[in-house]
């Protein structure tokens, strides 16, 4: 039994880091493998993660962490019974993938303006809470070419757009994702999408 693709890990910078790797053949990850991880610090504790299958030869493990600070560094040991298959380390602050925003809502009751709001996925006491910026993706269900991205570079989790920038009488979908420049994070996953019917009053034209 050998590791074909070494574990790579990302942290949500809150409580979970996710590590993925591939074995050289079909593996029952949860019965055959264990990933041990330990904070490199005084009187730290070794933890065991039981991996799950992620495709035939792929494994994924969700490492629980009480808290994360930028200096944290973890040792990782991948075991198959008594055999050490791989040894490495992981610094969560250098591999951050934020949690996805939630509760995306489209408010259409403001005249001719669409207000999109969503929730910051972090509690106020988390470092990333005040450092997230967002990308909002809006697309038409009827027209694949009608696809746009709005970058929200301010902290407020909301976006206002004129309803007239979209076609009237058509159903649209929106989703949102987040990243944090301070830790040069990857983008989060997209939030679940939300759907609405775009309709607005055409401006009255005088001839």
């Amino acid at each position: 039994m050998k590791v074909l693709q070494e574990p790579t890990c990302v942290s949500d910078y809150m409580s979970i880091s996710t590590c993925e790797w591939k074995m050289n053949g079909p593996t029952n990850c949860s019965t055959e493998l264990r990933l041990l991880y330990q904070l490199v610090f005084l009187l730290s504790e070794a933890h065991t993660c039981i991996p799950e299958n992620n495709g035939g030869a792929g494994c994924v493990c969700h490492l629980l962490m009480d808290d994360v600070v930028s200096a944290d560094n973890y040792t990782l040991d991948l075991w198959a019974g008594q055999q050490l298959l791989w040894k490495g380390s992981f610094k969560p602050s250098e591999h951050v993938k934020p949690r996805a925003p939630g509760n995306l809502t489209v408010h259409t009751n403001v005249s001719d303006t669409l207000l999109l709001t969503w929730s910051n996925p972090y509690p106020p006491d988390n470092y990333l809470y005040n450092h997230l910026t967002y990308a909002v993706n809006i697309w038409s269900e009827n027209d694949p070419a009608d696809f746009r991205i709005y970058n929200v570079t301010y902290l407020e989790p909301s976006l206002r757009i004129a309803a007239s920038t979209l076609k009237s009488g058509i159903s649209y979908r929106a989703r949102v994702r987040a990243w944090a420049q301070c830790y040069n994070t990857t983008w989060s996953e997209w939030s679940p999408s939300t759907k609405w019917h775009n309709s607005y009053r055409e401006p009255f034209e005088q001839h």
């Epitope: 904070l39 009187l43 504790e45 200096a71």
Partner: antibody
Amino acid sequence: QVQLQQSGAELVKPGASVKMSCKASVNTFAGYNMHWVKQTPGQGLEWIGGLHPGNGDTSYNQKFKGKATLTADKSSNTAYMQLSSLTSEDSAVYYCALTTAGRAWFAYWGQGTLVTVSA
Amino acid sequence: DIQMIQSTSSLSASLGDRVTISCRASQDISNYLNWYQQKPDGTVKLLIYYTSRLHSGVPSRFSGSGSGTDYSLTISNLEQEDIATYFCQQGNTLPWTFGGGTKLEIK
């Protein structure tokens, strides 16, 4: 809410030993470290050392090696510190303080145990 | 051992004031700087850990900042219950060490 309950004040003679306790109201004592801190008017706060109750690992401030011995009873979530060969220099308030395992900040503190060394 | 210097041993301020307490380390402590509050009855509480992280249950008027060797604790709107002695502590290098404390009093 985590609470640490320390044993009561001690009046001891020079040369004697004293053992104080600190009981933690936590679910799994093994996930924490228990540290001890000395406070005197002259020296202020001094870190004595820490213990991982789960595996018994300890770390001591060199200054207190041979003076303090840290132990724990996992079954009762209680940590102990024994101080030996006491002198007047050991008269102080001793605090137990809890950290999450492997952390360098004392998240919860006991109320302190006053030790007075006097003939 | 790393020396932690709180150059101001006592400080007087009025209720509602913005108060800043400083702490200097004798060498770089890589943000492993924590702040504690000790009330007159001896009760000790963690306020800020790792330079700027607010411990759970601590009012948001407390904040921390700094890097390298220089760190500070700020109370943005002083309240009566904040009357206490404040200690800094480094957790970067063994043995962990504390500052001498800054006693905060009301004018």
